[in-house]
Interface confidence: medium
């Protein structure tokens, strides 16, 4: 089966837009929009800091860390209001991701 131009293979994702704001010292805010073509029961999410198709139940229950959204060696920590997660690097630097 051939894919039309712009059509994604099932189970894959691509970044559509990526905006970075580095105007604040020691802080970079990035906003990313992705497009995914997921299998039934899956939904767009993040795995190992990259867009990915993940189990839809993870999104429904906001168990973000179950997507394994952080890089290997980083620690995932759910924000208590469940709006997202943090990834803590071994050196202590924290990257926060919020879902909207």
């Amino acid at each position: 089966q051939f894919l039309k131009e712009g059509q994604l293979a099932a189970g894959t994702c691509e970044i559509v837009t990526l905006d970075r704001d580095s105007s604040q010292p020691r802080r970079t805010i990035a906003r990313q929009t992705v497009k995914c073509s997921c299998f039934p029961g899956q939904i767009a999410g993040t795995t190992r800091a990259r867009p990915a198709c993940v189990d839809a139940r993870i999104i429904k229950t906001k168990q973000w860390c179950d997507m394994l959204p952080c890089l290997e060696g980083e620690g995932c920590d759910l924000l208590i209001n469940r709006s997202g997660w943090t990834c803590t690097q071994p050196g202590g630097r924290i990257k926060t991701t919020t879902v909207s």
Partner: antibody, heavy 122, light 110 residues
Framework: AVTLDESGGGLQTPGGALSLVCKAS????????MGWVRQAPGKGLEWVGV????????SYGSAVKGRATISRDNGQSTVRLQLNNLRAEDTGTYFC???????????????WGHGTEVIVSS | ALTQPSSVSANPGETVKITCSGG??????YGWYQQKSPSSAPLTVI????KRPSDIPSRFSGSKSGSTHTLTITGVQAEDEAVYFC??????????????FGAGTTLTVL
């Protein structure tokens, strides 16, 4: 075995402050969110608050919001509850609780401390 | 708030079901906590709907149907006599997600 050992309870005066400490052992402390639950004499369980793994994020129940501060020291495997402007209704047993997964809710507690009793009275 | 019966009773060997309904976060499921006396610490018998700590006997199980969760004790024993609290989360714009517990169900083994 997982153990959670609370300390710092006792007789407190209204308007004063208390500091409770929970010392954890038997698991990788920095990998779990932790919380505090209290129980007034003859009453049910009441959510006090929680803290995430790194200590950067906290949440509190409505009865203590604005008066409570939860902090943690992952190096010492301790979590602390500071409660200011004490009232008689803060009297009860305070339990330290461990979350079972990457977060703690009232549905995911898998271990409890033995509790420390707090009496607020003049 | 969570709703559970104030008391249930059973003979040894019988099956007991304690229900819990309400709460604002069914996706996160329910937990069940046993307290044998007012001065003792709670003990987790079920967390996250149906997970059982390794030291809890297999006669304790949890199940969910719609918005009602049920703790089942199959072949109840005298030592199961206790108060059982269910736990879930509720959401308010003021406090966000906050844990809530039922008022407790007293199980009497006759």
């Amino acid at each position: 075995a997982v153990t959670l050992d609370e300390s710092g309870g006792g007789l407190q005066t209204p308007g004063g402050a208390l500091s409770l400490v929970c010392k954890a052992s038997g698991f990788t402390f920095s990998s779990y969110q932790m919380g505090w639950v209290r129980q007034a004499p003859g009453k049910g369980l009441e959510w006090v608050g929680v803290i995430n793994k790194s200590g950067s994020d906290t949440s509190y129940g409505s009865a203590v919001k604005g008066r409570a501060t939860i902090s943690r020291d992952n190096g010492q495997s301790t979590v602390r509850l500071q409660l200011n402007n004490l009232r008689a209704e803060d009297t009860g047993t305070y339990f330290c609780a461990k979350g079972s997964a990457s977060y703690i809710t009232a549905a995911t507690i898998d271990a409890w401390g033995h509790g420390t009793e707090v009496i607020v009275s003049s | 708030a969570l709703t559970q019966p104030s008391s249930v009773s059973a003979n040894p060997g019988e099956t007991v079901k304690i229900t819990c309904s309400g709460g604002g976060s069914s996706g996160y499921g329910y937990g069940w906590y046993q307290q044998k006396s007012p001065s003792s610490a709670p003990l987790t018998v079920i967390y996250w709907n149906d997970k059982r700590p390794s030291d809890i006997p297999s006669r304790f199980s949890g199940s969910k149907s719609g918005s009602t969760h049920t703790l089942t004790i199959t072949g109840v024993q005298a030592e199961d006599e206790a108060v059982y609290f269910c736990g879930n989360d509720d959401y308010s714009s003021d406090s966000g997600y906050v844990g809530v517990f039922g008022a407790g169900t007293t199980l009497t083994v006759l």
